[in-house]
């Protein structure tokens, strides 16, 4: 048993059939002696009497608020909240494994830029009775400073007849240089509590290796005279890291139909213009990726062709 | 000040040119060693991340743009040693900045050279006949040293009597590629940088 | 699956007109870009341009323009190229290559032999 | 126009052997570059694109790399039927253009 936060403690249970639980005596938090007696969340039954109670805790049933009062008086109380163990592995029940960019991904992050902030979201079909708390640092053995705000619900979403909620957190780290080559991960924990259910997830990443800088912005068309060819210019998007001229970027300029399956012209560079070949009922999108360092490309910023 | 987004022609800078060779080079052999060494553990993930260079050079810092000299984080371990004439330095009016950012370069390069050449010494006694450094990495940063032309001691190359534990020389050649390839980035975004001043 | 199917060889005069045709199967002529691509005997590869079937859109190399006609006909999924004006060293294997890539050459058809001689 | 000059002309490799081609642009094309193995008597066939995008069905030893002027393809160990020409082609801008080719041929 561990002390969560003030008056919450975590028990952890290896969960397998007529399993013994463990034993917990918890102790209420009075000066007095005498004529206290406990009871489990709503209930009025007395549990037991005395300054500590024992108890095994077995299953949820064990699990909740214990109380302890003295003549019809609340003196202290202690949630008691189960996290489950099977088979060797702590249960992954409230999240909602994401598969990307691999199985067991439960917190997937980005950021915008080298800045030193970053955000991550989860997912889950739970709607209710459901808190997050999270903490992040660089490195874990001698922890330097990130500091996360709360986690909040940032979309929900109908997945055939379940509905999914996504929860998103930001978080800064304190002393940030965006040149830095960083050789100590980010190390971000989350704890999540359904009910009297408690579980906790993890993610460890570099910066650079989560780098998803926003669509370029200001995108413009130029036709060329006596030619099919069009030229299309953008800016590098206001998010990005400066100066450009060391944060470079490059981009992917493409011009496509509605369909996926459609044919395409496309082009990769540097610069921000390029000239492609504007169809009829096509769109001209452009995209861009840190051009030193290959993490993820950015949304498409489209412009239609006519 | 608003410094160009294109990337003028590398002629204009003959260390930029060399620079986007070396991180090609090193991303190619890094990514060889992944798949080559596959049972090993060879991905970010799984490696410890050193850099054979901490404090003997100084890259990130005496590299700063001039942007980042502002952010506090940025200048914790700032090093003030003069060093003089590169090749790379376009004009007498170079900064003596400039000149203490592309020594720490070059002997950065250098260090990783004297470790790479050790390394494919003790490779090349492997029996498996595993995995071999790249001879276009050695070339390349040879050809980024002879670039940049500064005048430094001669770092003798490391030779061990010990029987080689080829086990352990693979994981550190995973490591040195890791980190090799980190500051690679770091020397094109410089080279970037300055061919853009 | 996809293919190009090119028409047989031609020899040709000086001063004349050669008209390729290249057949398409295995796929609808309009879902994918067609070009033109010529090898001279024992050289290499040269682009002379591009048709978009849809639409009837074409561009030519600098080298070609005005001598050459690309079209299509999708009603029996075939692309022609004309070339006029013949001379010598047009003597070359002509292919027809197709891509839903605009600027690369995925599908190629088994090249057309046209000589050109006095 | 982009003129792009591969080499060597002709690479004589044993096989079994590791066999590099050269290719390089007249101006940087960033990775738009696509690699093409032709037989005696046959068409072009597409190998890798975009510089070092691999195609279903191309044995993977073939690989490439490079970016702005210089691109490398690599065979990493030479089967028989792999002797051929291979040619690079740029799609930076128009017109395209075609390397003139490495001839890999038996040792």
């Known amino acids: 048993i561990w002390e969560l936060k003030k008056d919450v403690y975590v028990v952890e249970l290896d969960w397998y059939p007529d399993a013994p639980g463990e034993m917990v005596v918890l102790t209420c938090d009075t000066p007095e002696e005498d004529g206290i007696t406990w009871t489990l969340d709503q209930s009025s039954e007395v549990l037991g009497s005395g300054k500590t109670l024992t108890i095994q805790v077995k299953e949820f049933g064990d699990a909740g608020q214990y109380t302890c009062h003295k003549g019809g008086e609340v003196l202290s109380h202690s949630l008691l909240l189960l996290h489950k163990k099977e088979d060797g592995i702590w249960s992954t029940d409230i999240l909602k494994d994401q598969k990307e960019p691999k199985n067991k991904t439960f917190l997937r992050c980005e950021a915008k830029n080298y800045s030193g902030r970053f955000t991550c979201w989860w997912l889950t079909t739970i709607s209710t009775d459901l808190t997050f708390s999270v903490k992040s640092s660089r490195g874990s053995s001698d922890p330097q400073g990130v500091t996360c705000g709360a986690a909040t619900l940032s979309a929900e979403r109908v997945r055939g007849d379940n509905k999914e909620y996504e929860y998103s957190v930001e978080c800064q780290e304190d002393s940030a240089c965006p040149a830095a080559e960083e050789s100590l991960p980010i190390e971000v924990m989350v704890d999540a509590v359904h009910k009297l259910k408690y579980e906790n997830y993890t993610s460890s990443f570099f910066i650079r290796d989560i780098i998803k800088p926003d669509p370029p912005k200001n995108l413009q068309l130029k036709p060329l005279k006596n030619s099919r060819q069009v030229e299309v210019s953008w800016e590098y998007p206001d998010t990005w890291s400066t100066p450009h001229s060391y944060f470079s970027l490059t981009f992917c300029v493409q011009v496509q139909g509605k369909s996926k399956r459609e044919k395409k012209d496309r082009v990769f560079t540097d610069k921000t213009s390029a000239t492609v070949i504007c169809r009829k009922n096509a769109s001209i999108s452009v995209r861009a990726q840190d051009r030193y360092y290959s993490s993820s490309w950015s949304e498409w910023a489209s412009v239609p062709c006519s | 000040r608003n410094l160009p987004v294109a990337t003028p022609d590398p002629g204009m800078f003959p260390c930029l040119h060399h620079s986007q060779n070396l991180l090609r080079a090193v991303s190619n052999m890094l990514q060889k060693a992944r798949q080559t060494l596959e049972f090993y553990p060879c991905t970010s993930e799984e490696i410890d991340h050193e850099d054979i260079t901490k404090d003997k050079t100084s890259t990130v810092e005496a590299c700063l743009p001039l942007e980042l000299t502002k952010n506090e984080s940025c200048l914790n371990s700032r090093e003030t040693s003069f060093i003089t004439n590169g090749s790379c330095l376009a004009s007498r009016k170079t900064s003596f900045m400039m000149a203490l950012c592309l020594s720490s370069i070059y002997e950065d390069l250098k260090m990783y050279q004297v470790e790479f050449k050790t390394m494919n010494a003790k490779l090349l006694m492997d029996p498996k006949r595993q995995i071999f450094l790249d001879q276009n990495m050695l070339a390349v940063i040879d050809e980024l040293m002879q670039a940049l032309n500064f005048n430094s001691e001669t770092v003798p190359q490391k030779s061990s009597l010990e029987e080689p534990d080829f086990y352990k020389t693979k994981i550190k050649l995973c490591i040195l590629l890791h980190a090799f390839r980190i500051r690679a980035v770091t020397i094109d975004r410089v080279m970037s940088y300055l061919n853009a001043s | 699956q996809v293919q190009l199917v090119q028409s047989g060889a031609e020899v040709k005069k000086p001063g004349a007109s050669v008209k390729v045709s290249c057949k398409a199967s295995?796929?609808?002529?309009?879902?994918?870009?067609l070009h033109w691509v010529r090898q001279a005997p024992g050289q290499g590869l040269e682009w002379m341009g591009w048709i978009d079937p849809e639409n009837g859109d074409t561009e030519s190399a600098p080298k070609f323009q005005g001598r050459v006609t690309m079209t299509t006909d999708t009603s029996t999924s075939t692309a022609y190229m004309e070339l006029r004006s013949l001379r010598s060293d047009d003597t070359a294997v002509y292919y027809c290559?197709?891509?839903?890539?605009?600027?690369?050459?995925?599908?190629w058809g088994q090249g057309t032999m046209v000589t050109v001689s006095s | 126009e982009i003129v792009m000059t591969q080499s060597p002309a002709t690479l004589s490799v044993s096989p079994g052997e590791r066999a590099t081609l050269s290719c390089r642009a007249s101006?940087?094309?960033?990775?738009?570059l696509h690699w093409y193995q032709q037989k005696p008597g046959q068409a072009p066939r597409l190998l890798i694109y975009?510089?070092?995008q691999s195609i279903s069905g191309i044995p993977a030893r073939f690989s490439g790399s490079g970016s702005g002027t210089e691109f490398t393809l690599t065979i990493s160990s030479l089967q028989s039927e792999d002797f051929a020409v291979y040619y690079c082609q740029q799609s930076n801008s128009f017109p395209l253009t075609f390397g003139g080719g490495t001839k890999v041929e038996i040792k």
């Open positions: 101006q940087s094309i960033s990775i738009n």
């Open positions: 290559a197709a891509n839903k890539e605009l600027r690369y050459f995925d599908v």
């Open positions: 295995g796929y609808t002529l309009t879902d994918y870009y």
């Open positions: 975009f510089a070092s």
